[in-house]
Interface confidence: low
Amino acid sequence: SASSRRRQQSRNRSTQSQDVARVSSASDYNSSELKTACRKHELYVSFQDLGWQDWIIAPKGYAANYCDGECSFPLNAHMNATNHAIVQTLVHLMNPEYVPKPCCAPTKLNAISVLYFDDNSNVILKKYRNMVVRACGCH
Amino acid sequence: SASSRRRQQSRNRSTQSQDVARVSSASDYNSSELKTACRKHELYVSFQDLGWQDWIIAPKGYAANYCDGECSFPLNAHMNATNHAIVQTLVHLMNPEYVPKPCCAPTKLNAISVLYFDDNSNVILKKYRNMVVRACGCH
């Protein structure tokens, strides 16, 4: 039908819209510092480095990890992108000055247990939520 | 006690170390383009602008919104920061080249209903999750 032909043409037009982000991601950085796609990076945090060694008894530190990388189109399945992030990448292509790319953020976080002194020098064992990055995605 | 004094001093030091981020966030940008704190920004997405007007029947577009802004220490309550984000800001202060700041991402997303033609020109009404940003936070 005419309407399905129009839709097909429309899709063919939009065909060429979205890979542009890979270019803009390249131009966002000097070639020497091109970012890879959004992913989890390993990071060990030492409580001593944070200056907390005198009130955190254990552990001495933990594998916190962090998220970093590009959220450029196409947002492949492993990027755990939300529907909104997919739409935002398209809007960014057309208005890169106005709307940023989605950002690479934790999608799964785990807790850790910490043994520490409270303000009254009591020893407390407490579970702290959302301390360890398990997975990252584009949001 | 001596240990509690040490802990107090340690906390004072870490307090001072954390406000530094306000300065570092300022120095990350030219004064003409200083970023505000992480927050929700309004954004209307027109499906025509995305080239989808011939296969999305309704709505013509929607208020998608987006998140943008700085996640610098101190991460105030309204920034909806996770424990991990708070730790990451401290690590970033000490290793800005190595670990990025947390990023400003949606914390609450809503669905919208979309009426569209599928590939066989059937009219489909479907609710799509995670399409509208309701709130943002540092992650």
């Epitope: 899709r11 037009r13 939009s14 065909t15 060429q16 542009v20 997919i86 057309m94 | 479907k126 799509y128």
Partner: nanobody, 124 residues
Framework: EVQLVESGGGFVQAGGSLRLSCAAS????????MGWYRQAPGKQRELVAA???????NYADSVKGRFTISRDNAKNTLYLQMNSLKPEDTAVYYC???????????WGSGNDYWGQGTQVTVSS
């Protein structure tokens, strides 16, 4: 499925020109984005150029002013006109297409399709 076939590669002297073509077939109605990538020996694949739904274009900094991307919807073909070629442009050039469909599963972005590549060699 989408099939992509590139052509137009070859050997050229520095300063010369080539025109690459990419013919798309199959479920082309589902394609939403197309671009040209290249991969030099020992290097990562990089995007060279792409074209938006309105026909606006974007280029990698290294090819701006020298390369031009275009398309012919009637022929379902994507082109890359490469002028003032340099030895550092030597690479295998790939055509890519990306699909994003409104499906029952969501706003799908999962498929990107690739051609087999065409070799471009620029000698000094």
């Amino acid at each position: 499925e989408v099939q992509l076939v590139e052509s137009g590669g070859g050997f050229v002297q520095a300063g010369g020109s080539l025109r690459l073509s990419c013919a798309a077939s199959g479920s082309i109605f589902s394609i939403n984005a197309m671009g040209w990538y290249r991969q030099a020996p020992g290097k990562q694949r990089e995007l060279v150029a792409a074209i938006t739904s309105g026909g606006s274009t974007n280029y990698a900094d290294s090819v701006k002013g020298r390369f031009t991307i275009s398309r012919d919807n009637a022929k379902n073909t994507l082109y890359l006109q490469m002028n003032s070629l340099k030895p550092e442009d030597t690479a295998v050039y790939y055509c890519s297409a990306v699909t994003i469909l409104l499906t029952s599963g969501g706003w799908g972005s999962g498929n990107d399709y690739w051609g087999q590549g065409t070799q471009v060699t620029v000698s000094s």
